[in-house]
Amino acid sequence: APTSSPAKETQQHLEQLLLDLQVLLRGIDNYKNLKLPMMLTFKFYLPKQATELKHLQCLENELGALQRVLDLTQSKSFHLEDAGNFISNIRVTVVKLKGSENKFECQFDDEPATVVEFLRRWIAICQSIISTMTQ
């Protein structure tokens, strides 16, 4: 059976991560006319720099806060069958991409962001890394 190259696998994981983040943002945007203000009280921290896979450590650091936001939305009305499982899947993908031995010390922006700003920024980061890989 043909085996995919490490680079191809990495790209597939990045595309899966991008898809998951887009699903979350879409869910929250659908929530906008409903209970979004409750979710906007949460602070998220964005990386000063995120251009490489090791920088995904900064995303992993924030997954706990993301989980709490999803808990608040009561996943039924958010159209996520299993919010906890969803975050677990993102965490597994992130670890695959950055490596479990990664000891990268994340540097965050001083200004915190809302969950919407946070997801938009990480979607852009994933898209940027993917486009760099495919060049």
Epitope: N33, L34, K35, P37, M38, T41, F42, K43, R68, T114
Partner: antibody
Framework: EVQLVQSGAEVKKPGESLKISCKGS????????IGWVRQMPGRGLEWMGT????????RYSPSFQGQVTTSADKSISTAYLQWGSLRASDTAMYYC??????????WGQGTMVTVSS | SYELTQPPSVSVSPGQTARITCSGD??????AYWYQQKPGQAPVLVIY???ERPSGIPERFSGSSSGTTVTLTISGVQAEDEADYYC???????????FGGGTQLTVLG
């Protein structure tokens, strides 16, 4: 103009029931949480709870859970706060406030409730 | 239940800078909001999301955040700024909102 107008002052006896109101205008009342805040004489603000008029989802402060009930009638853009049996310690000013983009940006003028035998 | 801690009172002379602090364990993860309340009036939002100022609020009002403490700063205090100031935030789950105990700002002279 966006505003919340609350019902007038009330004087009640201990053990009586009461329902006060908060009517929104100038915005889509359905899609903003309405919070209720108590201020006892000479004291600070206390968050009691919030209600989302579109589906009547409610959140109560643990301190007020079971003591009061919030409700809403979206057809007339009005939120309510009610007591089944008032006590003297319920004497306070009660404010409703709109929760928007994560802050209480618009406040009602307040309803003074006095409970005395 | 979750609490926000403020000093009961702060006194400053006109033209000076007043700083009112608010501490709470969840503040690194929850935005804070500041309200001004004058006697006999409903509260008014003066700072939201730690540092943002609503339209119509004078530039002398500003907010900052560091760890578990947020600070409301009023530069060049004026007599009309004499009021009670309340911080407000949510618990770590985002479910419950809470107000600090309030700080009475006195403008001397």
């Amino acid at each position: 103009e966006v505003q919340l107008v609350q019902s007038g002052a009330e004087v009640k006896k201990p053990g009586e029931s009461l329902k006060i109101s908060c009517k929104g205008s100038g915005y889509n009342f359905d899609t903003y949480w309405i919070g209720w805040v108590r201020q006892m004489p000479g004291r600070g603000l206390e968050w009691m709870g919030t209600i989302y008029p579109a589906d009547s989802d409610t959140r109560y402060s643990p301190s007020f859970q079971g003591q009061v009930t919030t409700s809403a009638d979206k057809s007339i853009s009005t939120a309510y706060l009610q007591w089944g049996s008032l006590r003297a310690s319920d004497t306070a000013m009660y404010y409703c406030a709109r929760f928007s983009s994560s802050a209480y940006d618009i406040w009602g003028q307040g309803t003074m409730v006095t409970v005395s035998s | 239940s979750y609490e926000l801690t403020q000093p009961p009172s702060v006194s400053v002379s006109p033209g000076q800078t007043a700083r009112i602090t608010c501490s709470g364990d969840a503040l690194p993860r929850q935005f804070a909001y500041w309200y001004q309340q004058k006697p006999g009036q409903a509260p008014v939002l003066v700072i939201y999301k730690d540092t943002e100022r609503p339209s119509g609020i004078p530039e002398r009002f500003s907010g900052s955040s560091s760890g578990t403490t947020v600070t409301l700063t009023i530069s060049g205090v004026q007599a009309e700024d004499e009021a009670d100031y309340y911080c407000q935030s949510a618990d770590s789950s985002g479910t419950y909102h809470v107000f600090g105990g309030g700080t009475q700002l006195t403008v001397l002279g």
